[in-house]
Interface confidence: low
């Protein structure tokens, strides 16, 4: 016998308590597959969070993060403040990078120059702490 | 460009049944769901049905039990039957798209029907 | 079923008014409330939907609130092609009823 519930599309919910009828997703809730006997509530983007895309009743809102943070985590689970390149966020907030290291994105952490003695290279053009050195040719 | 288009016998004798057509374009009944509503000269809007994209439907419980909805995805059709017909079936007859949190964005013109002998 | 009223069968109003429509539902919607116009010609479109929510390319004169059972469409600046009969519709409950219209008429 065939689940009466299958008939139910995404954007709706199988509604027990009146005879298993395909009843709509209430606002700010949504099923993104067939079959469902609840729908799920909407992800809602506040604070830091903002709205990338929309709930809808059949797929949830999206968040990516205010000006000034970054994503972080599978499906922007968190937003993370960004610093300037040459610097790195650390727990007392974004700090320089040490001489010999460099970061070039507003995230993440300083890495250290190439070394380019080890490829038998000289140095071509200095680093800084936005940009890796320049390894030119052997010497 | 989102169209719904009503299609239907514009007379019908009391007693018989009403087949009315939607066809839609620019949409597929696959993700969309498709509402019919009636009005009476001179009265207001009445919601007969529903039928969602995976086929289920959803009726007015004043006219369950002579009415049906069903479509044909491929042929981009909604249809809708009525049995034992009166005259106060007399109508305009819109099909409408579900959309969104189930409103209806998007009206079909409209197509008069009227019961008489 | 759940009864939808709209109280004013009709109304008389100046161009560049503000003009207010009530419906009120007969037992509470949560918010579940759409609003249409349709034009003398039989033309329905789609205004407003979950109470205030203003759908595409409709004029920003429009707008919508309430809550339980009592909601209200306002125009703040009528315009002549306003001219039209204005329906709410909940969608709490099955069957989904419409409210019995207002028809709006410029003075």
């Known amino acids: 016998l065939q689940d009466p519930c299958s008939n139910c599309p995404a954007g709706t919910f199988c509604d027990n308590n009146r005879n298993q009828i395909c009843s709509p997703c209430p606002p700010n809730s949504f099923s993104s597959a067939g079959g469902q006997r609840t729908c799920d509530i909407c992800r809602q983007c506040k604070g830091v969070f903002r709205t990338r895309k929309e709930c809808s009743s059949t797929s949830n809102a999206e968040c990516d993060c205010t000006p000034g943070f970054h994503c972080l985590g599978a499906g922007c689970s968190m937003c993370e403040q960004d610093c300037k390149q040459g610097q790195e966020l650390t727990k007392k907030g974004c700090k320089d990078c040490c001489f010999g290291t460099f970061n070039d994105q507003k995230r993440g952490i300083c890495r250290p120059w190439t070394n380019c003695s080890l490829d038998g290279k000289s140095v071509l053009v200095n680093g800084t702490k936005e940009r890796d050195v320049v390894c030119g040719p052997s010497p | 460009q989102v169209q719904l288009k009503e299609s239907g016998p514009g007379l019908v004798a009391p007693s018989q049944s009403l087949s009315i057509t939607c066809t839609v374009s620019?949409?597929?009944?696959?993700?969309?769901?498709i509402s019919w509503v009636r009005q009476p000269p001179g009265k207001g809007l009445e919601w007969l049905g529903i039928?969602?994209?995976?086929?289920?439907?959803n009726y007015n419980s004043a006219l369950k039990s002579r009415l049906s909805i069903s479509k044909d995805n491929s042929r981009s059709q909604v249809f809708l039957k009525m049995n034992s017909l009166q005259t106060d079936d007399t109508a305009r007859y819109y099909c409408?798209?579900?959309?969104?949190?189930?409103?209806?964005?998007?009206w079909g013109a409209g197509t008069t029907v009227t019961v008489s002998s | 079923d759940i009864q939808m009223t709209q109280s004013t069968s009709s109304l008389s109003a100046s161009v560049g008014d503000r003009v207010t429509i009530s419906c009120s539902a007969s037992?509470?919607?949560?918010?579940?409330l759409n609003w249409y116009q349709q034009k003398p010609d039989g033309t329905v479109k789609l205004l407003i939907y979950?109470?205030?929510s203003l759908h595409s390319g409709v004029p920003s004169r429009f707008s919508g609130s309430g809550s339980g059972t009592d909601y209200s469409l306002t125009i703040s600046n009528l315009e002549p092609e306003d001219i039209a009969t204005y329906y709410c519709?909940?969608?709490?409950?099955?069957?989904?009823?419409f409210g019995g219209g207002t028809k709006l008429e410029i003075k």
């Open positions: 409408a798209r579900g959309a969104g949190t189930w409103y209806f964005d998007v």
């Open positions: 620019g949409f597929s009944l696959t993700t969309y769901a």
């Open positions: 039928i969602w994209p995976g086929g289920g439907t």
């Open positions: 037992q509470g919607i949560s918010n579940y």
């Open positions: 979950y109470t205030s």
């Open positions: 519709q909940q969608y709490s409950k099955f069957p989904w009823t």
